[in-house]
């Protein structure tokens, strides 16, 4: 597709006369038709097979033509054509006398014509105009002339179409021949694949614009080269997708299980001894002064409990002070105002004068204590058991039960459930606060590992087209990684090619 | 963005319990070594620290209310509750949810819940 | 229990003056653990000064805290309009942990 471009320059008809000899009255009113055909050896009428095209009145006997409009007119004159350029053409240019305002054919009479030249040759498609000049006996006219191709049409014939864009089906603008220019960051035949972030993996990244890095499942990272761990692992690293093999001191599928919180985290604090006691849990033992579940806040005074026989304590500014019941005095309340005779001892404590009845003591029964035998004994009250036993009173004595995996008087002795190596099928065993766990390989579930679950989801080779198998250890499923143009569960599919273009 | 979340009546009657809930949301209450505190306000007065607990479910509160007081953890609703029981009118006062980091400022609060104790 | 006092109880400065508020404990205060808050009508505290000079996340630097021992100061620099409110400081280092009864600053 392109046009041929006619420019009408100067006309000469300086007697003003008709082709018949015969002058124009008052003057030639002249106006041209043009009529572009194929290549005729001699040209002769016949249908102007490549187009036809009229001026409006350019100017009487002789004149010059301006570039662009002249009275409602175009100059250059377009004749357009949606077929290849063959290179060669004929072309008629008639000079008409126009007596009134109708130009059409039929509307004038047969000797109106001026003058009719006709050429013949051949024409390359170019920018440049190829100026010519035709003289007559009595006429002459000075015209340029050439083809250029249509907008988005390229080549020699105008022939080749391209149009630039910048969607989904291409990012080119186009070379002067025709041939596609991709635009930066694309590439591909139609300028359809995106190029990647430098360093972008090429099996487990993907783009679908300019650097930009997208990853295949079970990848991650800025250049998707990391594997991406098992859904939920915690405390574990993988190899490839969907591993999760535990740092050390974590436990469990997830390795979310802290087997070592005291090591882990150091909670305790000013000095305070840790104790793990089971998952993610830990007990802090206070150097003297301090409190708090981590030990992390100084003791007040009154916090030990300094006050005897029933005295209430008090912080003050300066330390603390005791609020004495009747009968009792100093600073801690352990002197007694009262004697035998008042009976000051309670549940069948027993009565002994002091200081020649001045002051008493008590002798308490069993299970009680205090100095008025007051206070029934909880010999729990200095929490004697270890890793969380349960401190019972049992009479005179005192007895710790234990959680699990742990035995001993204080609970103080660590059962290892694991001794015994329960787990199967190489199965890893960890001591849990309630027993054992065991995490075990691929192929296996159970408590002890002992059932055989299925055999590798990847030893069928599911996966087509050269793609990289995952096994998925959670759900002993696979995944497929697709090499570059194919999708699918199991990449059987190729992308599907961009639609066909016209050339 | 770690935000809390305070909800429970703001009537309860003398020598009943008094129950609010703290909601932790933009972060989960098991991590790390925060410590999740219940403060309160007396109507024109300063502030007063009830106690914490931790995610392990370890406990410490103020020894002038550690017989009246239960803090509890609930990690499936990643929530922390206080109930105060035998209140009186005296514990009538503004009740603030906080956390601590691994000392005691709180650098996040709940909005606060006016609690008055009467019958 | 460590007993904070704070002076005065009411400061009344203008906006882009420097204002100075004191808390003073009944004890010395271990590692400095001290805290200043600011607190609004019917808001909770926030969080300015801990370590009795660190600032917290997002406070600017006008705010500012210095002191050991037993004796901490804030010091607020060019006074805004939003800086008026009652402040309170707290002690976090032995139990219980306590706060101060609090300094009100006003508009003059």
């Known amino acids: 597709s392109g046009v041929f471009q006619l420019q009408l320059q100067e006309f000469i008809n300086e007697r003003g006369v008709l082709a018949s000899g015969r002058p124009c009255e008052p003057g030639c009113r002249t106006f041209f038709r043009v009529c572009l055909k194929h290549f005729q050896a001699v040209v002769s009428p016949g249908p102007c097979t490549f187009g036809t095209v009229s001026t409006p009145v350019l100017g009487t006997n002789s004149f010059a033509v301006r570039d662009d409009s002249s009275g409602g007119g175009r100059n250059p004159l377009q004749l357009p054509f949606n077929f290849t350029w063959p290179g060669t053409f004929s072309l008629i240019i008639e000079a008409w006398h126009a007596p009134g305002d109708d130009l059409r054919p039929e509307a004038l009479p047969p000797d109106a014509l001026i003058s009719k030249i006709a050429i013949q040759g051949s024409l390359a498609v170019g920018q440049n105009w190829l100026l010519d000049e035709q003289t007559s006996t009595l006429t002459r006219l000075r015209y340029s002339y050439r083809v250029i191709c249509s907008d988005n049409y390229y080549g020699d014939n105008c022939s080749r179409l391209c149009k630039k864009r910048n969607d989904h089906f291409g990012h080119y603008v186009c070379q002067p021949d025709g041939n596609l220019s991709c635009l930066p960051g694309w590439t591909g035949e139609y300028c359809q694949q995106p190029i990647c972030l430098s360093g972008c993996h090429e099996q487990n990244g993907y783009c679908s614009k300019p650097a930009e890095c997208l990853c295949r499942p079970g990848w991650q990272g800025r250049l998707c080269n990391e594997c991406i761990p098992h859904n939920g692992c915690r405390h574990g690293t993988c190899s490839t997708p969907w591993q999760c093999t535990c740092d050390e001191g974590w436990g469990g599928l997830f390795c979310d299980q802290d087997l070592n919180y005291c090591t882990h985290h150091s909670p305790c604090k000013n000095g305070a001894t840790c104790s793990n006691s089971g998952q993610r849990s830990y007990t802090c033992t206070c150097r003297p002064g301090y409190t708090g579940v981590d030990c992390e806040l100084e003791l007040s005074e009154c916090d030990s409990n300094p006050c005897r026989n029933g005295g209430s304590c008090k912080d003050q500014e300066d330390g603390y002070h005791c609020l004495c019941p009747p009968g009792y005095y100093g600073l801690h309340c352990e002197h007694s105002t009262l004697s035998c005779a008042d009976s000051p001892c309670f549940n069948g404590g027993s009565c002994r004068e002091r200081n020649q009845g001045a002051n008493y003591a008590c002798e308490c029964p069993p299970n009680f204590t205090g100095s008025n035998c007051e206070k029934k004994v909880d010999r729990c009250t200095s929490n004697p058991c270890a890793n969380g036993g349960q401190c019972l009173n049992r009479g005179p004595s005192r007895m710790c039960r234990c959680r699990p995996g742990f035995t001993g008087t204080y609970c103080e002795l660590h059962v290892s459930d694991c001794a015994r190596n329960p787990c199967a099928h190489g199965g890893t065993c960890h001591d849990l606060e309630n027993g054992l766990m065991c995490t075990c390989p691929a192929g296996f579930s159970g408590r002890r590992c002992e059932v055989r679950t299925s055999i590798d989801a990847c030893a069928s080779s599911p996966c087509f087209n050269r793609a990289t198998c995952y096994t998925d250890l959670s759900t002993d499923t696979f995944v497929c990684n697709c090499p570059y143009g194919f999708v699918g569960s199991r990449c059987e599919f190729p992308v599907g090619l961009p639609p066909s273009f016209p050339w | 963005e770690v935000q809390l979340v305070q909800s429970g009546p703001g009537l309860v009657k003398p020598s009943q319990t008094l129950s609010l809930t703290c909601t932790v949301s933009?972060?989960?209450?098991?991590?790390?070594?925060?410590?999740w505190t219940w403060i309160r306000q007396h109507p024109g007065k300063g502030l007063e620290w009830i106690g914490y607990i931790k995610f392990s479910g370890n406990t410490y509160y103020n020894p002038s209310l550690r017989s009246r007081v239960t803090i509890s953890l609930d990690t499936s609703k990643n929530q922390f509750s206080l109930n105060m029981t035998s209140v009186t009118a005296a514990d009538t006062a503004v009740y603030y949810c906080a956390r601590a980091p691994g000392s005691h400022n709180f650098d996040i609060w709940g909005q606060g819940t006016m609690v008055t104790v009467s019958s | 229990a460590i007993r904070l006092t704070q002076s005065p109880d009411t400061l009344s400065l203008s906006p882009g003056e420097r204002a100075t508020l004191s808390c003073r404990a009944s004890v010395s205060i271990s590692n400095n653990y001290l805290a200043w808050y600011q607190q609004k009508p019917g808001q909770a505290p926030r969080l300015l000064i801990y370590g009795a000079s660190s600032r917290a996340t997002g406070i600017p630097d006008r705010f500012s805290g210095s002191g050991s021992g037993t004796d901490f100061t804030l010091t607020i620099r060019r006074l805004e309009s939003a800086d008026f409110a009652p402040y309170y400081c707290q002690q976090y280092s032995r139990s219980p942990i306590t706060f101060g009864q609090g300094t009100r600053l006003e508009i003059k």
């Open positions: 933009g972060g989960s209450i098991t991590s790390g070594g925060y410590y």
